[in-house]
Interface confidence: low
């Protein structure tokens, strides 16, 4: 009698997950009776992936009409693959008994799944940083097969150079992840700069996946201060305005001291936009000079984005002013300031 | 199921101080911007308190140094710490989730009331 | 600190009317207006953020406008579940501002 042959032909297929894999088994002789079942694995812990007999497995249909006498084809068609689906399976024939009792092994068919990565997150600082400082971005991207993957960096459009990348896990997996690590150098113009993280993997054909993450998040942006004095007007009053430019973000809030006594509190809001993504505030004050002996330091102090306040500040000269038309005047950069009679902020 | 549950409240003589919790499930509290708000009997509305993700804290004029607003990153919970308490500040306190990219608020708890009288 | 005024103080309306309140603020709040709907002994409901913007899960017979210092909240058929008191509040800069309220009642 010619012995039984369980002929896997593919030793190795490989499918885009979603898609459906077809395991191939023939037998050479349908003696003895008994079923033929596929097995994920080998050995005790082995997972039972088709029983001809019984069961329920909803994605595994086989391919040829197992309930025909001489069927000899006993190919698998399994639907959905995912990544969890990889692995080596295994078409055992068994003759029938109580229990039955496995024959014979076909060699076995590894199944590898191409999975597509996820699309790459970047994730920037847990806070801001200032100008000329190093940021760091992170990229993640999970999920891909085979491990094979290429990861770049752009700024605007150009390619990064400094950052470390990590794909887990080392050894053989059904699924990867990849991490990378960019370093970043942040100028003053990066309020609308844009990091790009890019994998290119087998399973894009060509069409690489892109994670992005705005610089704004990252960025802080300290104001400019300058006090200056407009002309005298007739009515004795002097327009002290206090010029808050170039910052970002908008959070700010700017206070007027008259020598050192807080005048007015005011919270920047619903500014226009600058082209370069900052933001420009302007604040003003009325001095009443008659209302004064002394001269009145007047302070622009500005707090912006939690940051410590900066302080400009500016001295009225009582004595200067015998109702001349003045020109104006630049602060000194110190810091305290005067209490208005009237104010407001453009 | 994204919640506040305030608790705390109670009478209290003026003078006296009161710490109210908010306690949060369903999101992270200290990725929003977190506020108080309370209500007098048959009045409206009135905003107390806020704290911002980074910590930063706003108060309204009348409790400004007998307030204060903090929250617990480990216990996902808001507090206010209520001392010098008048008989101007009994009232339903609710606590308030703002939300994530203008601070509109959007969940609200279900409030707790707060008496002050002797 | 920004005021914030409502009108009216109270409004008697009909099932099936279409009502609306108005808000004014006392400075330009641009569009970071909201309302709430708020029933006797209940918390306040997030209706509408900036200004027009439906909260998760409100109906769309609500509706609001107004940009800079004039806002407004119709509400489109009136229903015996909208009779409460509505709040509108500036969230541009703090302190934070409530309207006094606006008493929808059942005419």
């Known amino acids: 009698e010619e012995e039984l042959q369980v002929i896997q032909p593919e030793k190795s297929v490989s499918v885009a997950a979603g898609d459906s894999a077809t395991l191939n088994c023939t037998v050479s002789s349908l003696i003895p009776v008994g079923p033929i079942q596929w097995f994920r694995g080998a050995g005790p812990g082995r997972e039972l992936i088709y029983n001809l007999k019984e069961g329920h497995f909803p994605r595994v249909t086989p391919v040829s009409d197992p309930t025909k006498r001489n069927n000899m084809d006993f190919s698998i068609r399994i639907s959905n693959i995912t990544p969890a689906d990889a692995g080596t399976y295994y078409c055992v024939k068994f003759r029938k008994g109580s229990p039955d009792v496995e024959l014979k092994s076909g060699a076995g068919t590894e199944l590898s799944v191409r999975a597509k990565p996820s699309a790459p997150v970047v994730s920037g600082p847990a806070v801001r940083a200032t100008a000329e400082h190093t940021v760091s971005f992170t990229c993640e991207s999970h999920g891909f097969s085979p491990r094979d993957i290429t990861l770049k960096w752009f700024k605007n459009g150009n390619e990064l150079s400094d950052f470390q990348t990590n794909v887990d896990p080392a050894g053989k997996s059904v699924s990867y992840s990849i991490r990378s690590t960019a370093r970043v150098v942040l100028t003053r113009r990066d309020v609308h700069s844009q990091v790009i993280c890019e994998v290119a993997h087998v399973t894009l054909q060509g069409d690489p996946l892109r994670g992005t993450a705005n610089l704004s998040e990252a960025i802080r942006v300290p104001p400019f201060l300058e006090v200056t004095q407009q002309s005298m007007r007739a009515d004795n009053q002097v327009n002290v305005t206090c010029q808050v430019t170039k910052f970002y973000p908008q959070r700010l809030q700017l206070t007027w001291l008259e020598n050192g006594n807080v005048s007015r509190t005011e919270m920047a809001s619903a500014l226009p936009e600058n082209k370069d993504g900052t933001y420009n505030w302007t604040s003003w004050l009325l001095v009443n000079v008659s209302a004064h002996r002394d001269d009145v330091k007047l302070t622009c102090q500005v707090e912006h984005d939690g940051q410590p306040a900066v302080n400009k500040s500016f001295s009225v000269k009582v004595s200067a002013h015998p109702k001349e038309q003045g020109s104006n005047t630049a602060a000194e950069n110190t810091g305290t300031n005067e209490r208005n009679i009237y104010g407001g902020s453009g | 199921e994204v919640q506040l549950v305030e608790s705390g409240g109670g009478l209290v003589q003026p003078g006296g101080s009161l710490r109210l919790s908010c306690a949060a499930s369903?999101?992270?509290?200290?990725?929003?911007?977190m506020h108080w708000v309370r209500q007098a009997t048959g009045k409206g509305l009135e905003w107390v308190s806020a704290?911002?993700?980074?910590?930063?804290?706003y108060y309204t004029g009348s409790v400004k140094g007998r307030f204060t607003i903090s929250r617990e990153n480990a216990k996902n919970s808001l507090y206010l710490q209520m001392n010098s308490l008048r008989a101007a500040d009994t009232a339903v306190y609710y606590c308030?989730?703002?939300?994530?990219?203008?601070?509109?608020?959007?969940?609200w708890g279900q409030g707790t009331m707060v008496t002050v009288s002797s | 600190d920004i005021q914030m005024t409502q009108s009216p103080s109270s409004l008697s309306a009909s099932v099936g009317d279409r009502v609306t309140i108005t808000c004014r603020a006392s400075?330009?709040?641009?569009?970071?207006l909201a309302w709430f709907q708020q029933k006797p002994g209940k918390a306040p409901k997030s209706l509408i953020y900036?200004?027009?913007s439906l909260h998760s899960g409100v109906p769309s017979k609500f509706s609001g406008s107004g940009s800079g210092t004039d806002f407004t909240l119709t509400i489109s058929s009136l229903q015996p579940e909208d009779f409460a008191t509505y709040y509108c509040?500036?969230?541009?800069?703090?302190?934070?501002?409530f309207g006094q309220g606006t008493k929808l009642e059942i005419k």
């Open positions: 369903g999101f992270t509290l200290s990725s929003y911007d």
């Open positions: 400075q330009d709040i641009n569009n970071y």
């Open positions: 900036t200004a027009s």
């Open positions: 704290i911002g993700t980074a910590g930063d804290t």
């Open positions: 308030v989730r703002g939300g994530v990219w203008d601070d509109a608020f959007d969940i």
């Open positions: 509040q500036q969230y541009v800069s703090y302190p934070y501002t």
